[in-house]
């Protein structure tokens, strides 16, 4: 399955929008910094096939979309930027979904890498618990915004590598 060229443009737009969403100086939130243990090994693109990588990417974008679709998120960010960001993520989900569906229909496609899906889910669990613990404070959201920029960058890089494999 080939992701459309517009998909990589959407990736970049999402990153730009997320950068623009920053409201407070990252430096004023240094005390709130946290290591969420991003599962880098799931995004190096070496240890599994394209079909499995796309499932992991889908999980990553879906969890990001869900995180920024909560009421707490709506209260934290400027509404029009948040809506544009969510729209970009939604479009990416549609592209990835079409690819996964195509792979599901292929009998010889290897099984989904369950542990990779779980690793992504656990990563977002850590982010969710951090926000809950910090009572969704502005600084907590800023730390999370910076973290998601990092994770989306990893996703973008993995997608580039997958395109080069084709």
């Amino acid at each position: 399955c080939d992701l459309p060229q517009t998909h990589s443009l959407g990736n970049r737009r999402a990153l730009i929008l997320l950068a623009q969403m920053g409201r407070i100086s990252h430096f004023s939130c240094l005390k709130d910094r946290h290591d969420f243990g991003f599962p880098e090994e799931e995004f190096d693109g070496h240890q599994f096939q394209k079909a499995q990588a796309i499932s992991v990417l889908h999980e990553m974008i879906q969890q990001t979309f869900n995180l920024f679709s909560t009421e707490d998120s709506s209260a934290a960010w400027e509404q029009s930027l948040l809506e544009k960001f969510s729209t970009e993520l939604y479009q990416q989900l549609n592209d990835l979904e079409a690819c996964v569906i195509q792979e599901v229909g292929v009998e010889e496609t290897p099984l989904m890498n369950e542990d990779s899906i779980l690793a992504v889910r656990k990563y977002f669990q850590r982010i969710t618990l951090y926000l809950t613990e910090k009572k969704y404070s502005p600084c907590a959201w800023e730390v999370v915004r910076a973290e998601i920029m990092r994770s989306l960058s990893f996703s973008t890089n993995l997608q580039k590598r997958l395109r080069r494999k084709d």
Epitope: V100, V104, R121
Partner: antibody, heavy 119, light 108 residues
């Protein structure tokens, strides 16, 4: 509000199959994995597996791989679980439960469908 | 798979009594992925405690959860009649996800 609707009961004969349904409402169906859980009368809970309604990918408990098949119909926002080659061991209440994170993990359950396998 | 063993299987407590239910894991479980559910007869399970120690919405403050590694517990500081139910621990730290066999808590 989030709701998962399941039929109350199904009576089936040994060796037959049954397809259980779980109709979702109050949230975007394709955004969350749907899980299925088995509970035998007076017993604990067993996780059967999960399905992502967005693309249909499934993850199963090895113990249920040859017993259960999970599917979804996005148009009717319904998740299904087919149970095959039924025996008395399959007589149980089957719940669907929505995935999520933090305080939303299995925070929403269907009422459960009682499956009775009897000749 | 990670086996969760709950003890005792059944217990009864008087109103006002302190109650502790335990959940022992066959191998280590990260505390972030250890949950507790309450179930009353004829009803579906209800999320009660998430990530070891966080009370779900609407759960009375007399409940608390603690633990790490292979040993977890749910405590009721002062038993009330409405607390009579079955309690299940659950882990989603690794596949397949598992539940404990449950503790049925009765009121004396």
């Amino acid at each position: 509000q989030v709701q998962l609707q399941q039929p109350g009961a199904e009576l089936v004969k040994p060796g037959a199959s049954v397809k259980l349904s779980c109709k979702a409402s109050g949230y975007t169906f394709t955004n969350y994995w749907m899980h299925w859980v088995k509970q035998r009368p007076g017993q604990g809970l067993e996780w059967i597996g999960e399905i992502n309604p967005s693309h249909g990918r499934t993850i199963y408990n090895e113990n249920f791989k040859s017993k259960a098949t999970l599917t979804v119909d996005k148009s009717s926002i319904t998740a299904f679980m087919q149970l095959s080659s039924l025996t008395s061991e399959d007589s149980a209440v089957y719940f669907c439960a929505r995935g999520g994170l933090g305080p939303a993990w299995f925070a929403y359950w269907g009422q459960g469908t009682l499956v009775t396998v009897s000749a | 798979q990670i086996v969760l063993t709950q003890s005792p299987a059944i217990m009864s407590a008087s109103p006002g009594e302190k109650v502790t239910l335990t959940c022992s894991a066959g191998s280590s479980v990260d505390s972030s992925y250890l949950y507790w559910y309450q179930q009353k007869p004829g009803s579906s399970p209800k999320l009660w405690i998430y990530s070891t120690s966080n009370l779900a919405s609407g759960v009375p403050a007399r409940f608390s959860g603690s633990g790490s590694g292979t040993s977890y517990s749910l405590t009721i500081s002062s038993m009330e009649a409405e607390d009579a139910a079955s309690y299940f621990c659950h882990q989603w730290s690794s596949y397949p996800f598992t539940f404990g066999s449950g503790t049925k808590l009765e009121i004396k």
